[in-house]
């Protein structure tokens, strides 16, 4: 049965408006490839409506299919020799609960300095998303160059 | 209080369906790095439902959080060309009103000929979005290679 | 007249929740540049809610404006490989019915090994979307590296 038929009498709130757009706060300590995010109007144009931050990682509050998107720009590009820094890779995944751990989206910086992508994926309440940046180059903290967000799309 | 609880008695129209997808019309004159856009069924698959064009720039008609996306492909380009003409950079931002001027999204063409990205951002009625392409290379006007759009996501 | 005013008395189901996220199944035989997709919970995190697969190609079931997104990563690839096998190009388009055949989105792998983009486009019930990968390099079948999806956005 299609969702909306069963749900059509419920208030609009039940459809979910969960959405978040985050900016980079800092990188992780040794042996921790995760990027740590922050969000909120005081910080600029980032926000959280529904999802929450848990120690810099994004935690989902509503089950559903989400559009997850990310852009990360390196603060300095790899040289044309590229192999000097290769591989620098970004992966977005569910990192907790451990039973649901999975990589959702993965990209490598080859001779470019920015990766950007998006995908649809089912997420459940309590899923925490982690963004792992592996390599020796630093990410830019400029808010128009590095950002990460999710948008609830449907149940 | 979550938005939709307060809004649940309003007609669906109040949720907003504002959306636009534009194709490149032309580049600016000297000293004007802006790309000028066009949209409408007569032109192909571009359209404006809510937002409007003001001298080739996209003006927002409804407050809310929007998904902004763009793809720009350089016209006569190979990885060698791209690196030789480096830096070529694309920035999407609010250019008016001046009090709200800010860069929302920025990407450089390094050794590639196409950039594509997307982000969530709050926009207000009257905000005009500009897309600035700096560098000496020209963008392709093919409608499957260069396009720019917004989609209203939530209040 | 704005859509939602006319539609506001209809059940929410009429707004459409059509969405799909697919993973790569296989490439085509010789002379067939199409990628063949698969989806469903048994396969992992891919799914079809509304659209259907027709011999590995995505068929639309509901008229409307859709957000189409794709990421394709080449399997055995470095920036040197990518440039040596140039041009490798990905195009997403309507391939049937023939009367509506058109390229919607096109990207080249220059010195990169991944392309990712998205766009808004009107699609009609019965439109079949094809993704053509031209060149000699094979796409990765990792579900976090290569995926293709659509999301209904508005009528």
């Amino acid at each position: 049965q299609r969702f909306a038929q069963a749900q059509q009498q419920l208030p609009l709130e039940s459809l979910g408006w969960d959405v978040a757009e985050l900016q980079l706060n800092h990188t992780g300590p040794q042996q921790d490839p995760r990027l740590y995010w922050q969000g909120g109007p005081a910080l600029g144009r980032s926000f959280l409506h529904g999802p929450e931050l848990d120690k810099g990682q994004l935690r989902i509050h509503r089950d559903g299919i989400y559009m997850v998107h990310i852009q990360v720009t390196l603060a300095i590009c790899s040289s044309t020799t590229a192999s000097r820094h290769h591989p620098t890779t970004l992966a977005v995944g569910i990192c907790s609960p451990a039973s649901r751990s999975i990589s959702l989206l993965r990209l490598s910086f080859h001779q470019g300095c920015t990766i950007a992508s998006q995908r649809l994926t089912p997420l459940a309440r309590g899923d925490t998303l982690c963004t792992n940046l592996t390599g020796t180059l630093l990410p830019s903290r400029n808010t128009d160059e590095t950002f990460f967000g999710v948008q609830w799309v449907r149940p | 209080q979550r938005f939709a609880q307060a809004q649940q008695q309003l007609p669906l129209e109040s949720l907003g369906w504002d959306v636009a997808e534009l194709q490149l019309n032309h580049t600016g004159p000297q000293q004007d790095p802006r790309l000028y856009w066009q949209g409408g069924p007569a032109l192909g698959r571009s359209f404006l439902h809510g937002p409007e064009l003001d001298k080739g720039q996209l003006r927002i008609h409804r407050d809310g959080i929007y998904m902004v996306h763009i793809q720009v492909t350089l016209a006569i380009c190979s990885s060698t060309t791209a690196s030789r003409h480096h830096p070529t950079t694309l920035a999407v931002g609010i250019c008016s009103p001046a009090s709200r001027s800010i860069s929302l999204l920025r990407l450089s063409f390094h050794q590639g000929c196409t950039i594509a990205s997307q982000r969530l951002t709050p926009l207000a009625r009257g905000d005009t979005l500009c897309t600035n392409l700096t560098g000496t290379l020209l963008p392709s006007r093919n409608t499957d290679e260069t396009f720019f759009g917004v989609q209203w996501v939530r209040p | 007249q704005r859509f939602a005013q006319a539609q506001q008395q209809l059940p929410l189901e009429s707004l459409g929740w059509d969405v799909a996220e697919l993973q790569l199944n296989h490439t085509g035989p010789q002379q067939d540049p199409r990628l063949y997709w698969q989806g469903g919970p048994a396969l992992g995190r891919s799914f079809l809610h509304g659209p259907e697969l027709d011999k590995g190609q995505l068929r639309i079931h509901r008229d409307g404006i859709y957000m189409v997104h794709i990421q394709v990563t080449l399997a055995i690839c470095s920036s040197t490989t990518a440039s040596r096998h140039h041009p490798t190009t990905l195009a997403v388009g309507i391939c049937s019915p023939a009367s509506r055949s058109i390229s919607l989105l096109r990207l080249s792998f220059h010195q990169g090994c991944t392309i990712a983009s998205q766009r808004l486009t009107p699609l009609a019930r019965g439109d079949t979307l094809c993704t053509n990968l031209t060149g000699t390099l094979l796409p990765s079948r990792n579900t976090d590296e290569t995926f293709f999806g659509v999301q209904w956005v508005r009528p």
Epitope: Q30, A75, I76 | - | -
Partner: antibody, heavy 120, light 108 residues
Framework: EVQLLESGGGLVQPGGSLRLSCAAS????????MSWVRQAPGKGLEWVSV????????DYADSVKGRFTISRDNSKNTLYLQMNSLRAEDTAVYYC?????????????WGQGTLVTVSS | EIVLTQSPGTLSLSPGERATLSCRAS???????LAWYQQKPGQAPRLFIY???SRATGIPDRFSGSGSGTDFTLTISRLEPEDFAVYFC?????????FGQGTKLEIK
């Protein structure tokens, strides 16, 4: 006021080791990437190594890779450079420098430097 | 590695004159990521210009930076006695970041 104070320089024989320190004050040390930059006597500047704000990411110039190790202790507001297998060509004034907040690789504050002399 | 060549090696001018210092890169790099530093004898370098043309905090407006691609210029519109020093350019667009060999600005 932002202050960076290097120490630990001195005379060392080729093949020897030295550990430089940089004490930071006047800013939130844990929020900034830091680098070491050196300057041979009468010469130009050469970037040596970088470490991210929390210390998880490091990078080195090819000339020192495998011999030098950068680290930091955010609880002590201190940056370190462990230099092993020193060579005559490592002789220089070593500066610690703070990256711009965006993480871009330009340096908005520098220490006064500490001289390292590698000679037999 | 990108090589930055500064010219002239030494520039002899008098206070009140205009100084033009050049920095040329062996290849172009990202988004005009070029900085200029001033260094006086026995002192650490001090950031003057970043992003090719943005003045750092506290730098007087007689200093201006320009250029793009491979050719960059630092201009001092009217020299003051405290401006005589060595000036280094630095590119931070492509790893590893690199510096020019410096231009010595001396009193004529």
């Amino acid at each position: 006021e932002v202050q960076l104070l290097e120490s630990g320089g001195g005379l060392v024989q080729p093949g020897g080791s030295l550990r430089l320190s940089c004490a930071a004050s006047g800013f939130t040390f844990s929020s900034y990437a830091m680098s070491w930059v050196r300057q041979a006597p009468g010469k130009g500047l050469e970037w040596v190594s970088v470490i991210s704000d929390s210390g998880g990411t490091t990078d080195y110039a090819d000339s020192v890779k495998g011999r030098f190790t950068i680290s930091r202790d955010n609880s002590k507001n201190t940056l370190y450079l462990q230099m092993n297998s020193l060579r005559a060509e490592d002789t220089a004034v070593y500066y610690c420098a703070r990256h711009d907040y965006s993480n871009r690789y330009y340096f908005d504050y520098w220490g006064q430097g500490t001289l390292v002399t590698v000679s037999s | 590695e990108i090589v930055l060549t500064q010219s002239p090696g030494t520039l002899s001018l008098s206070p009140g004159e205009r100084a033009t210092l050049s920095c040329r890169a062996s290849q172009s790099f990202s988004s005009n990521y070029l900085a200029w530093y001033q260094q006086k004898p026995g002192q650490a370098p001090r950031l003057f210009i970043y992003g090719a043309s943005s003045r750092a905090t506290g730098i007087p407006d007689r200093f201006s930076g320009s250029g793009s691609g491979t050719d960059f210029t630092l201009t001092i519109s009217r020299l003051e006695p405290e401006d005589f020093a060595v000036y280094f350019c630095q590119q931070y667009g492509i790893s590893p970041c690199s510096f020019g060999q410096g231009t010595k600005l001396e009193i004529k």
